[in-house]
């Protein structure tokens, strides 16, 4: 949970933020995990710590490894891990998958491509942008602050976009590049009253006492990006967090899937070590969006272990 992957290219600047957050008044210590050796804070070092940030100016392949950050509040220490990989520069134009940041989607109405991680750096405009290694030219492309705007987006605009900028540290300049894929999506989205695909209404789920059981609440809400949509479980009409039974937990985070172009969400309810009293509870799968709320109720029944008598 508190580990983060970071990557960069040799001879470029790389700045990594501690995955654990804190207040400005908290102190942050950085260590090289393998040796437990403290990272210096003096800026004369090529690799140094600066509060929440770990700076490689510039990075070297040998810097690859796991770094530990400890955010020290007066009464509690929070530990995070930064898994840093520095790659050799590629001679050809192709950007390998392991150097790619998350893919962004655009449409005719919204075609912003943000330059990844740029907020960590001390940079000045303008940004340089490249598509498939070619410098972008023409009035359709506008570099604005930390993002690229493409006017009149077409399907041909899909591809890999690289931003290049200069990080300045105490008068010294370091180059940084970051690449992400851009896809063009059809904006013909719509929103529906939630449709619960699972469980079926008044479904009876067979469970074995003493074993673990999973219930999945799955619902679809329309097509394309949904402004507001959620699925959740309730026990006897109470939120899981309020019910106070640690054996019964919702899976953190909702999985989003696009089934036949539909925007769907699912939430798994995990019941550890099923007990008799769990059979008496009412399990409600709730799906809600701006159109309203739909509820499907599930009850548990005891599954008799299969007899193996001949």
């Amino acid at each position: 949970k508190f580990s983060k992957q970071s990557w960069g290219l040799e001879n470029e600047a790389l700045i990594v933020r501690c995955p654990r957050q804190g207040k400005p008044s908290y102190t942050v210590d950085w260590y090289y995990s393998q040796t437990n050796k403290s990272i210096p804070t003096q800026e004369r070092n090529r690799v140094f710590a600066s509060g929440q940030l770990l700076k490689f100016l510039p990075a070297a392949v040998a810097d690859s490894g796991i770094y530990t950050c400890i955010v020290r509040s007066p009464t509690f220490n929070r530990t995070g891990y930064a898994n840093v990989t520095i790659y050799k520069k590629q001679s050809d134009c192709n950007v390998p998958d392991y150097l790619m940041y998350s893919t962004v989607s655009g449409s005719e109405k919204n075609s912003k491509i943000y330059c990844p991680t740029i907020d960590l750096y001390n940079w000045t405009a303008p940004l340089e942008w490249f598509k498939n290694c070619q410098a972008l030219q023409g009035s359709r492309y506008r570099a604005h602050k930390s993002f690229l705007v493409i006017d009149n987006v077409m399907t041909e605009d899909a591809g890999d976009y690289t931003c290049k900028f200069i990080h300045n540290e105490n008068g010294a300049n370091y180059s940084v590049t970051a690449t992400r894929s851009f896809t063009v999506k059809d904006e013909q989205g719509f929103s529906l009253f939630p449709v619960i695909g699972a469980p079926a209404q008044n479904e009876i789920k067979e469970v074995e006492i003493g074993k673990n059981a999973n219930l999945t609440c799955s619902a679809c809400f329309g097509k394309g990006t949904q402004f507001l949509a959620a699925v959740l479980w309730q026990l006897n009409g109470t939120k899981i967090t309020d019910f106070g039974e640690p054996r019964i937990q919702q899976e953190e985070g909702q999985n989003q899937s696009f089934s036949n172009g539909l925007a769907c969400l699912d939430m798994v309810l995990r019941i550890a070590d099923v007990k008799e009293e769990d059979l008496l509870l009412q399990y409600d799968c709730l799906a809600l969006n701006l159109h309203g709320l739909r509820r499907h109720t599930v009850r548990l029944s005891r599954k008799n272990p299969i007899d193996h008598h001949s």
Partner: antibody, heavy 120, light 111 residues
Amino acid sequence: QVTLKESGPGILQPSQTLSLTCSFSGFSLSTSGMGVGWIRQPSGKGLEWLAHIWWDDVKQYNPALKSRLTISKDTSSSQVFLKSASVDTADTATYYCARIGGDYDYFDFWGQGTTLTVSS
Amino acid sequence: DIVLTQSPASLAVSLGQRATISCRASESVEYSGTSLMQWYQQKPGQPPKLLIYVASNVESGVPARFSGSGSGTDFSLNIHPVEEDDIAMYFCQQSRKVPWTFGGGTKLEIK
């Protein structure tokens, strides 16, 4: 503006479980550095810190009461909960929830408090 | 636990005069060069209100007649000039170590 409001049962019998809710607005408990704590004050007496919970779900308790207390949060509904098992007459007090904000760790906004009386 | 001892337990001051309340900690409340000591005012039937944080910073909206000073283990709250509206209980509080602790309180009255 920042507001906090406590709610509770008002009266309990000894050995029952106390459940308190703090509903707040004007800030989010998902914001880095934020926390919400519980403090109690018997009538005419001093203040006693009970527990607090941070934005990243780190929980801290008063060691003298830790075995009885459970603090939790529901970030999406802007609520913090405190449960105290097996109350006694000594738990009769006004219970406050308060925000821990600012650059340092301290209570900068307090709720009005909810009164608990434990009586058989 | 860090024990906070407030003195005096009660204080009667004439309007316009200076009120000084002392708070002594059983051990240092310093953290990274900062004293994690707060002062709160509490009027009857009301919750405590933050006056001073980290020893000497006056909370926004608090009148300038309130000031805090001290470091390490010895701290004080000054009110000058005292006004009728200042009649209340005053508590110091440390956030250096868990459990966070409060002083026993000082009752300010008008002579």
